[in-house]
């Protein structure tokens, strides 16, 4: 093994390098010293390092490591952050268009139901947005509410338009009758199934992307231990103490040190792999009734069909409801 | 059938109803994201190697530093000697992950569980139990998808035809990462960038 080159007799090189790290220099010895107080860069002979310099090197080493880690994850972080934002906005656009489609369907096919229908449709799609963003709303409740609200308007405006104003008191009775008589057939249930499946998948997709950001942010801002700081210092800076400014760490040695410093972070690997593969599986299944774009943009048509179903059975329904709600002002409908 | 004229759109610039074959759709964008994410599947296991390759390491030099002394790059001492009589590397590994890392692992386990639960098994996209109560007068078939947009002729086809790039102010090209131009080339697209 070749002998190490003699250390800089004046510590001049070490001083000029250290000055870049810590302007103001009172810590670099003029000439090599025994260095008995050193704890990391343990000297085999005279050294150009002091205890204070060692502390500064440790701090710098840990900072370097943090920067390396942040730059390592920059592309990945950018990818997930930007996609999370894009998908969230895209989903909101889908919801907005689904609402527009549905409102236009009412305006063109059932103008007498507006503006009440617009209000109910608006509330329904607001709930859809809230659900996608993680609010605790039950989809079945949302759909039931839409049909509960629509039926009294459909009944009083389309099926029985001659009702006097005082008969509007029957709205509560009509809400109850809507469910008991299944006036919309199986359409509410159909919509519940389609909407809940597509929205659940959409919501978990967004949640997963946001967690991806959280994972990267967590590992991005890890504070490395003192032990790790000492290892990094020994690898990156202790050679300077011997005046070996241009020497680089051995590759194998670097890998061993990094694996030591990163032991905790690397434990994420297994779950990270699983995360990406599970997300892929989810995405592969996001079509037809599991695709919110497909489901929501087709809702106006299903709602239209459900109203047609009511109209088709209007005669039978009007008779039944007439009997059922005749005395709704005197008694409570249950 | 549900009459739906185009002139009712509030922001037509976003929603193109025309059947454009290669339009960007949400599903294509999702698949594109997954492909990009898969190139980062080994991100965490590759980190130690990545950091070594992006920090000063002896590559072409004959001699290198092993933490204690100058040694020949291919000697046994290149990896080992620097570790002797110093704090125990094994101990460092045995400490286990930091609490924040343990927390994030728990969250990952939870989301992975949810993702697996939500994933649609192949060949079972349609739930047959929907019609347990039966539709009257044949409103929909067994396949509940038939009910989507089942309003007959002239019904606007709305399957995956939103053009989001028109409205979204984002461009997903990763080349546009601020400051990416002065950074190192990614290794195997695994992880990129750093300072020296």
């Amino acid at each position: 093994q070749p002998p190490p080159p003699p250390p800089d007799a004046t510590c001049h090189q070490v001083r000029s390098f250290f000055q870049r790290l810590q302007p103001g220099l009172k810590w670099v010895p003029e000439t090599p010293v025994p260095g008995s107080d050193l704890q990391v860069c343990l000297p085999k002979g005279p050294t150009c390092c002091s205890r204070k310099m060692e502390e500064k090197y440790q701090l710098t080493a840990r900072l370097n490591m943090e920067q390396l880690l942040q730059s390592a994850s920059m592309e990945l972080k950018f990818l997930i952050i930007q996609n999370a934002a894009v998908f969230q906005e895209a989903f909101e656009i889908v919801v907005r268009h689904a609402k527009n489609y549905t409102n236009a369907m009412f305006k063109n096919n059932y103008p007498s139901l507006t503006p009440q229908a617009f209000e109910f449709v608006g509330e329904f799609f607001t709930d859809v947005s809230l659900y996608i963003l993680g609010s605790d709303i039950n989809v079945d409740d949302m759909v039931n509410e839409l049909f509960d609200s629509l039926f009294p308007v459909i009944y009083t405006q389309l099926m029985n338009p001659g009702l006097p104003d005082s008969a509007l008191d029957i709205n509560e009775c009509l809400r109850g009758a809507r469910r008991d008589l299944k006036v919309f057939g199986n359409f509410p249930k159909l919509i519940m199934t389609q909407v809940s499946k597509s929205l659940q998948v959409t919501r978990i997709f967004l949640q997963a992307l946001n967690l991806g950001i959280e994972v990267i942010n967590t590992t991005d801002h890890l504070k490395f231990s003192k032990d790790c700081g000492r290892m990094l210092t020994r690898m990156w800076y202790c050679s300077y103490c011997q005046g070996l400014m241009m020497v680089k760490p051995c590759g194998g040695y670097c890998n061993v040190v990094m694996q030591g410093c990163m032991a905790g972070v690397v434990e994420i690997d297994k779950y990270w792999r699983e995360y990406i593969l599970s997300l892929e599986e989810l995405v592969n299944g996001m079509y037809r009734i599991y695709d919110m774009e497909n489901v929501l943009l087709g809702l106006f048509s299903t709602i239209h069909d459900s109203i047609q179903y009511v109209q088709k059975n209007a005669g039978k329904l009007t008779t039944t409801i007439g009997k059922l709600c005749a005395h709704s002002q005197q008694r409570q409908y249950r | 059938s549900a009459y739906y004229p185009e002139d009712l759109f509030i922001d037509k610039k976003v929603l193109k109803v025309a059947h454009v074959e290669h339009e960007e759709t949400l599903s294509s964008r999702r698949r594109e994201l997954i492909q990009k994410l898969k190139s980062f599947i080994s991100f965490y296991s590759a980190l130690p190697g990545y950091i070594c390759s992006h920090s000063p390491v002896a590559e072409n030099d004959t001699l290198c530093w092993n933490g204690q002394e100058l040694v020949e790059r291919y000697s046994q001492k290149a990896a080992r000697n620097g570790m002797k009589n110093q704090f125990n590397l094994h101990e460092l590994k045995m400490k286990g992950p930091e609490p924040v890392v343990s927390q994030i692992i728990d969250k990952l386990k939870h989301i992975n569980q949810l993702l697996r639960t939500m994933s649609v098994p192949k060949g079972r996209v349609l739930d047959k139990n929907l019609d347990e109560e039966g539709f009257e007068s044949g409103d929909c078939g067994d396949d509940e998808d038939e009910c989507i947009g089942g309003s007959g002729d002239g019904m606007m086809k709305v399957k995956n035809q939103l053009r989001f790039l028109a409205e979204l102010a984002y461009d997903l090209d990763v080349d546009d990462v601020p400051g990416n131009n002065q950074q190192a080339t990614p290794k195997d697209n695994e992880i990129s960038t750093f300072h020296n």
């Epitope: 209000e119 609010s135 709303i137 039950n138 | -």
Partner: antibody, heavy 121, light 111 residues
Framework: QVQLQESGGGLVQPGRSLRLSCAAS????????MHWVRQAPGKGLEWVSA????????YYADSVEGRFTISRDNSKNTLYLQMNSLRAEDTAVYYC??????????????WGQGTLVTVSS | QSALTQPPSASGSPGQSVTISCTGT?????????VSWYQQYPGKAPKLLIY???NRPSGVPDRFSGSKSGTSASLAITGLQAEDGADYYC??????????FGGGTKVTVLG
């Protein structure tokens, strides 16, 4: 006519439990979200809890989370609030209120007259 | 969850106008969420005045109007009358769908 009638209030010692009930009439109870709101003497309104029309979703204020439980029986048109581990600061008039929406909280368009709960040793 | 911010008091002479503000955050008033306003007389249950930011339930005089902009909402009472002297509360819900009330504003009709 739409009505809500609370019952079950009274004097109770700290740490003990109490169950409030609210009987609803004049509307389709199973179609609407329901709430409990309280008002301490001389103070403003403080929302306590809500439940969706089906009872599948429940919501609580931070101050009562884990101690109070809201529930409903749609077949009996009745709303309940089970209050455990009561504290002096839970002393208030408790109002039962009907929401104008069914799936979640929005606007409370019908209120009961309130029942007084006093927590004191 | 924190309460919405309202001024503790407001006053005006009969026939004048009074506006009460209600300030929240992006997760309640500023989100998708709607603002409601209530009127309460001493010893009585509150009564809904405005829902969905600006809608009046039937029976509420059109002297009462509501509006919302960003994270703030306001209730305007025009042509103030003696019976308008009461406590007024704004209310919204946060992103977790939990209801949040304002601290209340006492409106005094002078003279």
């Amino acid at each position: 006519q739409v009505q809500l009638q609370e019952s079950g209030g009274g004097l109770v010692q700290p740490g003990r439990s109490l169950r409030l009930s609210c009987a609803a009439s004049g509307f389709t109870f199973s179609s609407y979200a329901m709430h409990w709101v309280r008002q301490a003497p001389g103070k403003g309104l403080e929302w306590v809890s809500a439940i969706s029309s089906s009872g599948r979703s429940t919501y609580y204020a931070d101050s009562v989370e884990g101690r109070f439980t809201i529930s409903r029986d749609n077949s009996k048109n009745t709303l309940y609030l089970q209050m455990n581990s009561l504290r002096a600061e839970d002393t208030a008039v408790y109002y039962c209120a009907k929401d104008r929406r069914g799936s979640h909280a929005d606007a409370l368009n019908v209120w009961g007259q309130g029942t007084l709960v006093t927590v004191s040793s | 969850q924190s309460a919405l911010t309202q001024p503790p008091s407001a006053s005006g002479s009969p026939g004048q106008s009074v506006t009460i503000s209600c300030t929240g955050t992006s997760s309640d008033v500023g989100g998708y969420n709607y603002v409601s306003w209530y009127q309460q007389y001493p010893g009585k249950a509150p009564k809904l005045l405005i829902y969905g930011n600006s809608n009046r339930p039937s029976g509420v005089p059109d002297r009462f109007s509501g509006s919302k902009s960003g994270t703030s909402a306001s209730l305007a009472i025009t042509g103030l009358q003696a019976e308008d002297g009461a406590d007024y509360y704004c209310q919204s819900y946060d992103s977790s769908l939990r209801v949040v009330f304002g601290g209340g504003t006492k409106v005094t009709v002078l003279g």
